[in-house]
């Protein structure tokens, strides 16, 4: 079935019984409404499963699927399936065809910005195209972060986008770094944000048939020193077989620059701890947020002698955070068994008395051990 | 079909200049955002220079600005990359790459162009 | 800049394998990454676009997942045209920044 100017099933009468499926190509930026069943006892219009919302710019309503101006991302599957029977009362495939502008790519809805188009379409209010993209209201950012506005929207004529700041047009003039502003992707970008740059922002998107707006809310975050944070329960008890690989992770948060430290515990002399009652430690990997993979320890064709305690130990200039997992290396001859690995319950202090390497941060500091 | 022709790379001595050119075609050239990306040899990928269809919107990597300008002639189809002050951390292959409208994902490349930057 | 922590760097996989890439931004990005596959030799080929969009012509056994800070790729079944360098890219700043890339080798 090739659709032409719209994409239409009217009017809204029952169905037949034999409901076949059926393939609809529609171009870019067209318009489509499809029935299904009479409006008040009309289906309820399900796209890849899930069912579609009464309001939007794909919506479901009334046994009616409406969609605004058809974009690449609403190709696909759409039922249609009768109120409490669940019966299917239309089975449709929507396909991406051309789009209604002289080109030929159809990756993408260009009819909405080419102000040149030479089709006569009806004119359009502007209306948003990616409402998704716009759920977050609230940005609340730490301090030197990039903050991005977006509005994507569509209407013939094309719109037109501008922002306020808290009503008051806004350039961006008197911001230090100023402001970027992306107009195909309907955008305000920000960077390096500062508590002044706080408050409401709207975007005002508008053409000669209507105007729509959207606010924002602006918070930047004061920079509040802290050691690093670990996420819980990294890194975790790890059961492997002799010969595998086994990777441990540890996800760490921290606003100053944080470095890393994967510590393998040892036994030296017979013991895991020295005189002063700290324990020994192994210094397995080094570096900085930045490098690749440093959150990772691999562990390649693991041995007997690789099971033990691990310890990710993350430092900035504030403080020392670390955790500790149990690493259980099992015999190739009997993958099935598992040990529950002892659990750690420290409350000596823990010292490091090794040669971090790490800027002074980790020397003779004294720390509490946390799980 | 969307296709993307790079010329222009070579041999340049460092402080010297080079014009890249990016033919465009199979697609309506001016409603679109363009980018230029390059790959030093053996590195990973990284991000240059991007212009929107209408040139009123223009970025740069902090490590090329002021040393490079993009440009575009919608007229005709072409995308350009004006590299002066040439520097040996220049040498890479450099691609033209087009934008998805509404994101700014590179959703057609053009094959590279060499551009090695010795004495 | 933003800054985009790519893992692993490099890792072997076999035929049919799962394989997971994961990429880590240095702020909050929302969903505006994308992931791109090389081969050598070759321009880069746009594989996920918004985390988690699927290109045309890509086949089903790649997604992407994730928002805000932490991202992921997966190829659901390894295939022999699959061994190549990922890289993830976001474009969340104007300043548009990649991963280190992810090479992924026969094992």
């Known amino acids: 079935l090739e659709a032409s100017e719209e994409v239409e099933l009217e009017p809204c009468l029952a169905p037949s019984l034999e409901q076949q499926e059926q393939e609809l190509t529609v171009a870019l930026g067209q318009p489509v409404r499809l029935c299904c069943g009479r409006a008040e006892r009309g289906g309820h219009w399900y796209k890849e499963g899930s069912r579609l919302a009464p309001a939007g710019r794909v919506r479901g309503w009334r046994g009616r699927l409406e969609i605004a101006s058809f974009l690449p991302e609403d190709a696909g599957r759409y039922l249609c399936l009768a109120r409490g029977s669940m019966i299917v009362l239309q089975n449709l495939t929507l396909i991406t065809g051309d789009s209604l502008t002289s080109s030929n790519d159809d990756e993408d809805p260009k009819s909405h910005r080419d102000p040149s188009n030479r089709h006569s379409y009806p004119q359009q209010a502007p209306y948003w195209t990616h409402p998704q993209r716009m759920e977050k209201k609230l940005h609340a950012v730490p301090a030197g972060n990039t903050v991005k506005f977006r509005c994507p929207a569509a209407g013939n004529p094309t719109p037109t986008i501008r922002w306020l700041k808290d009503g008051q047009a806004f350039h961006g003039e008197n911001r230090i770094g100023g402001i970027r502003l992306r107009h195909q992707h309907w955008s305000l970008v920000m960077e390096s944000v500062v508590p002044s740059d706080r408050g409401t922002y709207t975007c005002l998107v508008e053409n000669a048939v209507g105007s729509i707006r959207y606010n924002y809310l602006l918070d930047v975050l004061e920079r509040s020193p802290h050691r690093p944070i670990l996420q819980a329960g990294l890194p975790a008890n790890t059961t492997a077989v002799v010969g595998s690989d086994v990777e441990l992770l540890c996800k760490v948060y921290s606003d100053a620059q944080p470095h890393i430290q994967w510590l393998k515990h040892i036994v030296i002399n017979g013991s895991s701890f020295g005189a002063d009652g700290f324990p020994y430690v192994q210094v397995l990997k080094t570096a900085d947020i930045n490098s690749s993979e440093v959150e990772v320890l691999y562990l390649r064709n693991v041995s007997a002698e690789d099971a033990g305690e691990y310890t990710c130990l993350a430092g900035n200039s504030i403080g020392l955070s670390y955790q500790s997992a149990w690493l259980t290396v099992l015999p190739e001859e009997d993958p099935t068994w598992t040990a529950a690995a002892p659990e750690a319950r420290y409350t000596d202090k823990l010292e490091f008395r090794h040669d971090s390497g790490l800027n002074d941060i980790f020397e003779a500091q004294k720390i509490e051990w946390h799980e | 079909q969307v296709q993307l022709l790079e010329s222009g790379g070579g041999l340049v001595q460092p402080g010297g200049s080079l014009r890249l050119s990016c033919a465009a075609s199979g697609f309506t050239f001016s409603d679109y955002a363009m980018s230029w990306v390059r790959q030093a040899p053996g590195k990973g990928l990284e991000w240059v220079s991007t212009?929107?269809?209408?040139?009123?919107?223009?970025e740069y990597a902090d490590s090329v600005k002021g040393r490079f300008t993009i440009s575009r002639d919608n007229s005709k189809n072409t995308l350009y990359l004006q590299m002066n002050s040439l520097r040996a951390e220049d040498t890479a292959v450099y691609y033209c790459a087009r934008e998805r409208t509404y994101s700014s994902a590179f959703d057609y490349w053009g094959q590279g162009t060499l551009v090695t930057v010795s004495s | 800049d933003i800054q985009m922590t790519q893992s692993p760097s490099s890792l072997s996989a076999s035929v049919g394998d799962r394989v997971t890439i994961t990429c880590r931004a240095s702020q909050d990005i929302s969903s505006d990454l994308n992931w791109y596959q090389q081969k050598p030799g070759k321009a880069p080929k746009l594989l996920i676009y918004?985390?988690?969009n699927l290109q045309s012509g890509v086949p089903s056994r790649f997604s992407g997942s994730g928002s805000g800070t932490d991202f992921t790729l997966t190829i659901s079944s390894l295939q022999p045209e699959d061994f190549a360098t990922y890289y993830c890219?976001?474009?969340?700043?104007?300043?548009?920044?990649f991963g280190q890339g992810t090479k992924v080798e026969i094992k």
């Open positions: 212009i929107e269809g209408d040139s009123n919107y223009i």
């Open positions: 918004d985390a988690s």
């Open positions: 890219h976001q474009w969340y700043s104007t300043l548009y920044t």
